[in-house]
């Protein structure tokens, strides 16, 4: 029963978390522009990964797409790519963890299928959750270094009369959908991880042989000597295996994933 | 055609307070962006402030923050510029004018205009 | 606050001559997010409001002659009338629309020769 819950429950923060990573890498707010002194501006900036966009006063927006790949920053490309990946190995990890769902039976497949199935979709959410969270962080980092350099020279002055105001940005909502977004993945993934150990069938037995003196015919026991031999003594997994109480319509509604804003 | 008639002239004395009109036609009024600028005798322009019609918000100019309310009736397409604590160096004509939404912040359409004398 | 200064104070200029207006701003009004310069242009007659002529720094107003050009980026702006007419007799002023306060220019007039 827990195994189930523990697995369950692990797939569905890994999907809330990769839907907010999809969410994150499509999001125009990565860095919003610096609103210091002046909370209410005129013209307000903001860029993502793909565009960078303007939303006037009357409320008109006009985003540009970055339609250049060599001109971009390399820690630009360096973030789509680990967004990217981790969406891609997320995505598959969704797609392996379906099956390998407890509750879901699809043919004879075997517990120990599953658990593999469980182990392997657990570590993707885990490179998954780790890449979006890189990414982020590397775009943050990008951005701390570039405000500080631009507050150095906040006023360039033609002559000392002209003054150029250069445009700081600062952390855009995407960063923090990121990152959230990032630790729930992670989480699942340790927790289809450890449901995995759970799911995990009892190392294979040695039949035990009961020899009887009469010469009478061999009684093969599975498991009888278990007690004594030490052999399959991992009690605690027998235990949770054995409960004999789990079925397999104990599927759980989970609340479903709603979109920001 | 879009319009932006405004209320007629007033006078007023020092320290009252004066509500001007400006109705709208001809557009969709929560879909722009209205403002507020003034014109002392033979001066320039003068930004006063500018009222969202759809989310009532303001945006005013520090000049005039304390003493400027500008509201809006939806259900009249009507915007309204209330001064307070009027001055002899208020006198000036208010324009109401709409801000030319994808027009990099310019203002398209403007009112005929009111003149407000303060005069004790 | 941005400061918009405008030259000359005043100008006269002979039916069917060029005339030219600048407008010089205390910061910047171009905008490196959409690449844009954030002034616009009206010009006023006597007893009437303002009227929109350009927008964007060098966008013409629809309905407005094309002998109206607007010109310049960042801090030096530029209005040219190609071949005056008798009805472009008018104060014409500069708008910061960047940054607020919105701040005008003193005015130009423009006067026939």
């Known amino acids: 029963m827990a195994v189930t819950a523990c697995q369950g429950l692990g797939f569905v923060v890994s999907l809330i978390g990769i839907a907010g990573i999809i969410a994150a890498t499509c999001m125009d707010q990565w860095s919003t522009q610096d609103l210091y002194n002046n909370p209410v501006t005129a013209v307000f900036n903001y860029q993502g990964l793909w565009r960078s966009c303007v939303r006037e006063s009357s409320g008109f927006t006009e985003c540009r797409g970055y339609f250049t790949l060599l001109g971009l920053p390399a820690m630009l490309q360096a973030v789509r790519a680990l967004m990217i990946v981790g969406i891609v190995l997320g995505a598959i990890g969704l797609l392996v963890s379906i099956f390998a769902l407890k509750c879901i039976r699809i043919g004879s497949m075997e517990d120990s299928a599953k658990a593999n199935m469980t182990l392997t979709s657990g570590i993707m959410f885990i490179v998954s959750g780790l890449c979006a969270i890189a990414g982020v962080s590397v775009f943050a980092n990008m951005l701390v270094t570039n405000f500080w350099m631009s507050t150095a020279n906040m006023y360039t002055g033609m002559g000392g009369m002209v003054q150029t105001v250069q445009t700081r940005y600062t952390f855009g909502a995407a960063l923090f959908v990121g990152w959230v977004a990032g630790g729930l993945t992670l989480i699942g993934g340790v927790m289809m991880c450890i449901a995995c150990r759970g799911l995990a069938p009892e190392e294979t037995n040695y039949k035990a042989v009961s020899y009887h003196a009469s010469g009478h015919s061999v009684a093969y026991k599975p498991g009888g000597f278990k007690a004594s031999t030490g052999f399959g003594s991992n009690t605690k997994n027998k235990k949770i295996y054995d409960g004999g109480a789990r079925t397999e319509d104990e599927v759980q509604s989970y609340p479903s994933k709603h979109d920001y804003v | 055609q879009v319009q932006l008639v405004q209320s007629g002239a007033e006078v007023k004395k020092p320290g009252a307070s004066v509500k001007v009109s400006c109705k709208t036609s001809g557009y969709s009024f929560t879909d722009y962006l209205m403002l507020w600028v003034r014109q002392a005798p033979g001066q320039g322009l003068e930004w006063m402030g500018n009222i969202n019609p759809y989310y009532g918000r303001t945006t005013y100019a520090l000049k005039f923050k304390g003493r400027v309310t500008m509201t809006v009736d939806r259900s009249t397409s009507t915007v309204y510029m209330e001064l307070s604590s009027l001055r002899s160096e208020d006198t000036a004509v208010y324009y109401c004018?709409?801000?030319?939404?994808?027009?990099?912040?310019?203002?398209?359409?403007w009112g005929q205009g009111t003149l407000v004398t303060v005069s004790s | 606050d941005i400061v918009m200064t405008q030259s000359p104070y005043s100008l006269a200029v002979s039916l069917g001559e060029r005339a030219t207006i600048n407008c010089k701003s205390s910061?910047?009004?171009?905008?490196?997010?959409?690449?844009?310069?954030?002034l616009a242009w009206y010009q006023q007659k006597p007893g009437q409001p303002p009227k929109l002529l350009i927008y964007g720094a060098s966008t013409r107003e629809s309905g407005v002659p094309d002998r109206f050009t607007g010109s310049g980026s960042g801090t030096d702006f530029t209005l040219t009338i190609s071949s005056l007419q008798a009805e472009d007799v008018a104060v014409y002023y500069c708008?910061?629309?960047?940054?607020?306060?919105?701040?005008f220019g003193q005015g130009t007039k423009v006067e026939i020769k």
């Open positions: 910061q910047s009004l171009f905008n490196s997010g959409n690449q844009k310069n954030y």
């Open positions: 708008q910061n629309a960047h940054s607020y306060p919105y701040t």
């Open positions: 004018a709409r801000d030319g939404y994808s027009l990099r912040n310019a203002m398209d359409y």
